[in-house]
């Protein structure tokens, strides 16, 4: 059985479209599961993995490897 584009699995009922944009950064494995591109995480792979050591409380990142500090915090790790 050949599935339509973006459909996977037994019965072709699993949907996955690879994307690399604001709404997700992932490929699809042979079963239609999302596999996040390097530097991205979360169920939709749209959450950047910040610089290692970046304070989860006082730092954040829009792009992988970044560490942007909240107002009033500074340093490489916003700690």
């Amino acid at each position: 059985v050949t599935c339509d584009d973006y459909y996977y699995g037994f019965g072709c009922n699993k949907f996955c479209r690879p994307r690399d944009d604001f709404f997700g950064h992932y490929a699809c494995d042979q079963n239609g599961n999302k596999t996040c591109m390097e530097g991205w995480m979360g169920p939709e792979c749209n959450r950047a993995i910040c610089r290692q050591g970046c304070s989860p409380k006082h730092g954040s990142c829009k792009l992988p490897g970044d560490c942007r500090c909240q107002y009033g915090w500074q340093g490489l790790y916003c700690d």
Partner: antibody, heavy 119, light 107 residues
């Protein structure tokens, strides 16, 4: 279960700004974008933009670029939509909404916030 | 940007009727289409996504079909609670635009 609870109705003067809040619960706030959709009285639905609460990244519909600001407070799991330079045509119900799992479109919606712009 | 054209804009039908609403995209949206139902004073409710997949707790009388640029929502046998406004929406690429809506009224 996923819940999105919005702030109450607002009446604003033309030229002013409004800030609508959307408090999320029942899921990890930083895992999904929060989208905003508006609906003028008797009209259709209009996508305004989205924010990724984890890092603050935003995407806006061109029509609203420069006039709308989306923000998120991770500590309270609350998203905000601020619309500036209000005009009468901005009178609408504003909804926050979230995608479902496996790339669903908008499976979860807030109850809506009516913003009335009147002099 | 992809535009969505929905037709008809309004429709009168009776309980038990079979009803079809169509949506045409200005470009190929590869089945990335959703249908919503909205009742007055309420938020929209997701009915169908990926053109043909029924959302949770949606009755089987609703079905979706289509591909490429042309899509259809069918209600096989109208029930009293189905009288509402229906919207299509693509989510292929931002901006995720909606169709203009179809108001389904009791004949």
């Amino acid at each position: 279960q996923v819940q999105l609870v919005q702030s109450g109705a607002e009446v604003k003067k033309p030229g002013s700004s409004v800030k609508v809040s959307c408090k999320a619960s029942g899921y990890t706030f930083t895992d999904y974008e929060m989208h905003w959709v508006r609906q003028a009285p008797g009209q259709g639905l209009e996508w305004m933009g989205a924010i990724q609460p984890g890092g603050g990244g935003t995407a806006y519909a061109q029509k609203f670029q420069g006039r709308v600001t989306l923000t998120a407070d991770k500590s309270t799991s609350t998203a905000y939509m601020e619309l500036s330079s209000l005009r009468s045509e901005d009178t609408a119900v504003y909804y926050c909404t979230r995608r479902g799992y496996d790339d669903y479109p908008f499976a979860y919606w807030g109850q809506g916030t009516l913003v009335t712009v009147s002099s | 940007d992809i535009q969505m054209t929905q037709s008809p804009s309004s429709l009168s039908a009776s309980v038990g009727d079979r009803v079809t609403i169509t949506c045409r995209a200005s470009g190929n949206i590869h089945n990335y289409l959703a249908w919503y139902q909205q009742k007055p004073g309420k938020a929209p409710k997701l009915l169908i996504y990926n053109a043909k997949t029924l959302a949770d707790d949606v009755p089987s009388r609703f079905s979706g079909s289509g591909s490429g640029t042309d899509y259809t929502l069918t209600i096989s046998s109208l029930q009293p609670e189905d009288f509402a406004t229906y919207y299509c929406q693509h989510f292929w690429s931002a901006p995720w635009t909606f169709g203009g809506g179809t108001k389904l009224e009791i004949k």
